[in-house]
Amino acid sequence: NKILVKQSPMLVAYDNAVNLSCKYSYNLFSREFRASLHKGLDSAVEVCVVYGNYSQQLQVYSKTGFNCDGKLGNESVTFYLQNLYVNQTDIYFCKIEVMYPPPYLDNEKSNGTIIHVKGKHLCPSPLFPGPSKP
């Protein structure tokens, strides 16, 4: 059995920020799970991770320098991405793993969401250099 994931086909980030909602065919209430958002056709960049646990607050983090937050619904996780750069326009995929109680469940690969970053051109940090000028 696989969890099905629904995402908007496309979102436009006008102010370098966007809410991406991942809707699951599974109720996450009282489960322990790991929801994540991945960038690129190959899902190579793990943008944001949300850990859900029966007893603790949501743990939300990014190991790849994205400014993200997460919100949990019964059958959804919403990722709030801020300070996006125009060159981070890409396709983003929701993933979910439900670990406890057994059995382990994960999702069928979703169709993804194209996030088109149209916001103001933020001054990129050295970690995210913009295109070089001649």
């Epitope: 322990e32 790991r34 793993e97 670990m99 406890y100 109680p101 057994p102 059995p103 382990y104 994960d106």
Partner: antibody
């Protein structure tokens, strides 16, 4: 038949680190099951350390989370346990084990003894 | 964390005796009718061996004199007729949620 063989145990200084290996044969560690590390202090009970899923996701015991890393090398079909800032209380036999569909541990390695002492 | 309390901590019995070990969880380990409670046997210097999973299902290759029962918070491991090779320490384990926890063990000794 699934076989798990741990190695890397021995005498470690307090404050040091250990890196244990668990070589699996007869089953691919990236297949549908998940893999745990469990330890047993001399004369004591069993303590779960953490686990790695076939996806690569990891879960750790809250009491050890800040000091432990579980990883794997798919090409070698081997799991690893890294434990830092070792104390005398970390002296134990360390086992790797496979979790079945109910998360019972159906296959275990023979264990490797780690002694933390100066 | 879910605490598992086994009783007794140790017992002395003779070959042929019926032995019962109990495991009580600090909260229910049931989910959709399945009890995520398992039993192991461990002999000195050896790794634990899975006997019973999901409270009552006998692991392949384990003799039928071992049986498990219970649900919710109260579970029992029974050895119907103790054999010489059964003298060992027995542990229960829950996998309902993290951290996975074990009982403190019950040592079965020869009377």
């Amino acid at each position: 038949e699934v076989q798990l063989v741990e190695s890397g145990g021995g005498l470690v200084q307090p404050g040091g680190s250990l890196r244990l290996s668990c070589a699996a044969s007869g089953y691919s560690i990236t297949s549908g099951h998940h893999w745990s590390w469990i330890r047993q202090a001399p004369g004591k009970g069993l303590e779960w350390i953490g686990e790695i899923y076939h996806s690569g996701s990891t879960y750790y015991s809250p009491s050890l989370k800040s000091r432990v890393t579980i990883s794997r090398d798919n090409s070698k079909n081997t799991l690893y346990l890294q434990l830092n800032s070792l104390r005398a209380e970390d002296t134990a036999v360390y086992y790797c084990a496979r979790k079945d569909d109910y998360y019972a541990f159906d296959y275990w390695g023979q264990g490797t003894l780690v002694t933390v002492s100066s | 964390d879910i605490q598992l309390t086994q009783s007794p901590s140790s017992l002395s019995a003779s070959v042929g005796d019926r032995v019962t070990i109990t495991c009580r969880a600090s909260e229910s380990v049931d989910f959709y009718g399945i009890s995520f409670l398992h039993w192991y046997q461990q002999k000195p210097g050896k790794a634990p061996k899975l006997l019973i999973y999901a409270a009552s299902t006998l692991q392949s290759g384990v003799p039928s004199r071992f049986s498990g029962s219970g649900s919710g918070t109260d579970f029992t491991l029974t050895i119907s007729s103790l054999q010489p090779e059964d003298f060992a320490t027995y542990y229960c384990q829950q996998s309902y949620r993290t951290p996975i926890t074990f009982g403190q063990g019950t040592k079965v000794e020869i009377k």
